[in-house]
């Protein structure tokens, strides 16, 4: 089976059940349902999944049985529309059920909520978790899939199966350990952090496909796969790009069974043809399916072939550039992007796409000019400032990070971004700026050759979080503009924003700066978030405050928290000292 199956199946549901096996089938249907109906209780979803699974088994037994010929969207949509509380729980999403496929599925997709109103997941005591795991392992793992899927409605479903496998392995090992907590908690922290990163990366892929189209996603994939597999031929890269695009289109479109099946086929193809693709795949290809697919997706770049010729000769100096371009524009541009990317693992994907766009724009203009060759002869000179801009930005920010450390670097970014887009909600500014700040510890440790791809491509992922959160409740024209004009220029667009001079400062509200003794029992991370929330609010009240003023207020605030957390009567300390702090801060900032 290739990724594109030409053979027709009488029953699509039977076909996928047989391909994936019962365990994966049930897990993927649960993920799909939880990603669509994010507010439904776990038990309701399990009931729906069991009904679908029983139906699939009847179709496996007899593909001609009643309704077995229906599409998966029809079957799943019909099942979702049986939920009794649809109108009360989801409001207008219930109107989707009046539509026919494919409009009904599109309607469900449009109602996916990137920031659902769900309680934060609180981790129970280790013994409680281990007991639950031993009492009913299957329910315990299903609950994990459900809770992640409903909070991350675009999570890459086959990858979530991989996370669930690791989650199970962690409990299997650690619940037998002498010190269960020491064994389990670091593993759960790692899974949580990796899961958040995986969710955000996939969200960018889906945004790329849904907001900018297949061509944008394919261009991204050509650049990335050419960097990763520089020894592979262009046709090989093109085939992988086509197949990868199909996989992600399916997952982003809610077609999770097809997506997981096709991803498995793609991994199989890559491993069968690794000699033509990359020398780095050997270890990945010896692993079981879920690990294999994950490993391939994360595999390091292969070594660049020796003696790659200069690109200038055929893409700039040749008199045939316009003839070649006119004959097959997308192939020619694809080849340019492939050739440039495989020579530049040191560039971010978004930079490579900016260069390719500049090249395309130049050819469009010059090939219509009187002397095309004269017109495009200097096109590579136009690349220089595009390359230097992210290089300089990363250099400056890494220096700042090394000087400040992560927490204070995040604070600098909080101030910077609040001044740029003060209309954005405080929780969003805190979340996004904290994540932007993590670029320092993630990327600045790398040598120069790895810094840009690490930093700028990570920033693209984080800024996409800002874009999808802002899209739900748009409040800033500047954010909308940077998010929608160009996918590859989002980061330079945000970088170029200055202080928003049109912003009317927020009214001062003492309640915003009132703190209680509960802050003392918070984890270091939660305490930081409290302080950073206060910092954003300060900037919203006083956008023209200087760095020095803000630093003084924040230092006073840190001292105040430390003092009151050591006090015998903490609550009284917070009440009395808090009033003094607010008054002193107002005076310092001239509020």
């Amino acid at each position: 089976r290739g990724v594109f199956r030409r053979d027709a199946h009488k029953s699509e549901v039977a076909h996928r059940f047989k391909d994936l096996g019962e365990e994966n089938f049930k897990a993927l249907v649960l993920i799909a349902f939880a990603q669509y109906l994010q507010q439904c209780p776990f038990e309701d979803h399990v009931k729906l999944v069991n009904e679908v699974t029983e139906f699939a088994k009847t179709c496996v037994a007899d593909e001609s049985a009643e309704n077995c010929d229906k599409s998966l969207h029809t079957l799943f949509g019909d099942k979702l529309c049986t939920v009794a509380t649809l109108r009360e729980t989801y409001g207008e999403m219930a109107d989707c059920c009046a539509k026919q496929e494919p409009e009904r599925n599109e309607c469900f997709l449009q109602h996916k909520d990137d920031n659902p109103n769900l309680p934060r997941l609180v981790r129970p005591e280790v013994d409680v978790m281990c007991t639950a795991f031993h009492d009913n392992e299957e329910t315990f793992l299903k609950k994990y899939l459900y809770e992640i899927a409903r909070r991350h409605p675009y999570f890459y479903a086959p990858e979530l199966l991989f996370f669930a496998k690791r989650y199970k392995a962690a409990f299997t090992e650690c619940c037998q350990a002498a010190d269960k907590a020491a064994c389990l908690l670091p593993k759960l922290d790692e899974l949580r952090d990796e899961g958040k990163a995986s969710s955000a990366k996939q969200r960018l892929k889906c945004a790329s496909l849904q907001k900018f189209g297949e061509r944008a996603f394919k261009a991204w994939a050509v650049a990335r796969l050419s960097q990763r597999f520089p020894k592979a031929e262009f046709a090989e890269v093109s085939k992988l790009v086509t197949d990868l695009t199909k996989v992600h289109t399916e997952c982003c479109h809610g077609d999770l069974l097809e997506c997981a099946d096709d991803r498995a086929d793609l991994a199989k193809y890559i491993c069968e043809n690794q000699d033509s693709i990359s020398s780095k795949l050997k270890e990945c290809c010896e692993k079981p399916l879920l690990e294999k697919s994950h490993c391939i997706a994360e595999v390091e770049n292969d070594e660049m072939p020796a003696d790659l010729p200069s690109l200038a000769a055929d893409f700039v100096e040749s008199k045939d550039v316009c003839k070649n371009y006119a004959e097959a524009k997308d192939v020619f541009l694809g080849m340019f992007l492939y050739e440039y990317a495989r020579r530049h693992p040191d560039y971010s994907v978004v930079l490579l796409l900016r260069l390719a766009k500049t090249y395309e724009t130049t050819l469009e203009k010059c090939c219509a000019a009187a002397d095309p060759h004269e017109c495009y002869a200097k096109v590579f000179d136009e690349f220089k400032p595009l390359v230097e801009e992210p290089q300089n930005l990363i250099k400056q920010n890494c220096e700042l990070f090394e000087q400040l450390g992560e927490y204070k670097f995040q604070n600098a970014l909080l101030v910077r971004y609040t001044k740029k887009v003060p209309q954005v909600s405080t929780p969003t500014l805190v979340e996004v700026s904290r994540n932007l700040g993590k670029v320092g510890s993630k990327c600045c440790k790398h040598p120069e050759a790895k810094r840009m791809p690490c930093a700028e491509d990570y920033l693209s992922v984080v800024l996409n979080q800002l874009c999808v959160l802002h899209e739900k409740t748009p409040v800033s024209d500047r954010v909308t503009k940077c998010c929608t004009e160009s996918l590859v220029n989002r980061r330079p667009c945000f970088s170029a924003l200055e202080v928003d001079e049109t912003y009317v400062p927020k009214e001062f509200n003492a309640e915003t700066f009132t703190f209680h003794a509960d802050i003392c029992t918070l984890s270091e991370k939660e305490r930081q978030i409290k302080k950073q929330t206060a910092l954003v609010e300060l900037v919203k009240h006083k956008p023209k405050a200087t760095k020095e003023q803000l630093k003084a207020v924040m230092d006073d605030f840190a001292a105040f928290v430390e003092k009151c957390c050591k006090a015998d009567d903490k609550e009284t300390c917070f009440a009395e000292e808090g009033k003094k702090l607010v008054a002193a801060s107002q005076a310092a900032l001239g509020l």
Epitope: F234, S276, L308, P309, D320, N324, A328, V331
Partner: nanobody
């Protein structure tokens, strides 16, 4: 219509060298992926080396890496294969082929659209 004409084959001793040439006429950007294939008696046709005539990137099958060099002269519409350190197992009919860079794969002869008639290379003492 693209036409390909090979030359340069012949008899050579083990360890010797040969240079094959392939003149292309009528080719365009969509046939700018060019390659050399070979077929030994009773065996399947296999890819030896390919080149993008726009971009200049080259690819080789493992058995000839370090011994064979593919090159092109766009001004003469000619493709070359310099073969050094020849071995008895290199004996075969060598074919020049052309196709679209978006499709051509050295390991799959069916992805090349145009073929020459072939030139025989015999390595024997």
């Amino acid at each position: 219509e693209v036409q390909l004409l090979e030359s340069g084959g012949g008899l050579v001793q083990p360890g010797g060298s040969l240079r094959l040439s392939c003149v292309a006429s009528g080719n365009t950007y969509l046939t700018s992926c060019m390659g050399w294939f070979r077929q030994a008696p009773g065996k399947e046709r296999e890819g030896v080396s390919s080149i993008y005539t726009v971009g200049g990137s080259t690819f080789y099958t493992n058995s000839v890496k370090g011994r064979f060099t593919i090159s092109r002269d766009n001004s003469k519409n000619t493709l070359y294969l310099q073969m050094n350190s020849l071995r008895a197992e290199d004996t075969a009919v060598y074919y020049c082929a052309a196709g679209s860079p978006a499709r051509c794969r050295l390991r799959d002869p069916t992805t090349f659209d145009y073929w020459g008639q072939g030139t025989l290379v015999t390595v024997s003492s």
